[in-house]
Amino acid sequence: VSITKCSSDMNGYCLHGQCIYLVDMSQNYCRCEVGYTGVRCEHFFL
């Protein structure tokens, strides 16, 4: 799957992670920091 960085107007989309754009899926996707999960990395787990 091809990926690019999200545009700057997506700042804030991923709450605890990096936003990437999946070209083939036309998808806003969050690559979460360690310890976080959820579509927008909104959940913390121990």
Epitope: S2, D9, S26, N28
Partner: antibody, heavy 115, light 107 residues
Framework: QVQLQQPGAELVKPGASVKLSCKAS????????MHWVKQRPGQGLEWIGE????????NYNEKFKSKATLTVDKSSSTAYMQLSSLTSEDSAVYYC????????WGQGTLVTVSA | DIQMTQSPSSLSASLGERVSLTCRAS??????LSWLQQKPDGTIKRLIY???TLDSGVPKRFSGSRSGSDYSLTISSLESEDFADYYC?????????FGGGTKLEIK
């Protein structure tokens, strides 16, 4: 399961406008850009444009920039396309679609422009 | 705009036959191409993305390949539900553009 619900048909008068809806369910609405595609009777597919439901960002086919306006309502997970100054050339089926794995398409709205 | 020239525009074939459809891109699209199937009732689904990756739930008799600026969709052994219209779509640049379509009919 993912669903994109579109009304079946719209009959509109020449010169008028129409706002087509596409209600999404079964997935996170803000995660996938919504595309709109036109198909004239017996013809092929034409890409109109796409909208990012998270922030309303759009990309249009230049050909449709003065014809179509894409918007979303995040609270109801609904995408809209307004078509203006309608002529017989705008009579077509209009589809909304997301490119999620498996791809999902609405059933299409048939727009008929007739006096 | 990138033009996608699709051939043939129509094709008659028999059950069990192997068929190939081709799209040629007027500019480099770097494999950003998908193949779509439209049934007579208007239902559309994507079969292939990234030129050769099979989409979720698509039978393995479908395959996609690339040779330079030519992209092909091959159906290894036609089944009755495969008779439909097929379109290629490039998503390398804006505007996204479709090929003119291929109508696959039963012989």
């Amino acid at each position: 399961q993912v669903q994109l619900q579109q009304p079946g048909a719209e009959l509109v008068k020449p010169g008028a406008s129409v706002k087509l809806s596409c209600k999404a369910s079964g997935y996170t609405f803000t995660s996938y850009w919504m595309h709109w595609v036109k198909q004239r009777p017996g013809q092929g597919l034409e890409w109109i444009g796409e909208i990012n439901p998270y922030n309303g960002g759009t990309n249009y086919n230049e050909k449709f920039k003065s014809k179509a306006t894409l918007t979303v309502d995040k609270s109801s997970s609904t995408a809209y396309m307004q078509l203006s100054s309608l002529t017989s050339e705008d009579s077509a089926v209009y589809y909304c679609t997301i490119w999620k794995l498996g791809t999902y398409w609405g059933q299409g709205t048939l727009v008929t422009v007739s006096a | 705009d990138i033009q996608m020239t699709q051939s043939p525009s129509s094709l008659s074939a028999s059950l069990g036959e192997r068929v190939s459809l081709t799209c040629r891109a007027s500019q480099e699209i770097s494999g950003y191409l998908s193949w779509l199937q439209q049934k007579p009732d208007g239902t559309i689904k994507r079969l292939i993305y990234a030129a050769s990756t099979l989409d979720s739930g698509v039978p393995k008799r479908f395959s996609g390949s690339r040779s330079g600026s030519d992209y092909s969709l091959t159906i290894s052994s036609l089944e009755s539900e495969d008779f439909a219209d097929y379109y290629c779509l490039q998503y390398a640049s804006y505007p996204r553009t479709f090929g003119g379509g291929t109508k696959l009919e039963i012989k």
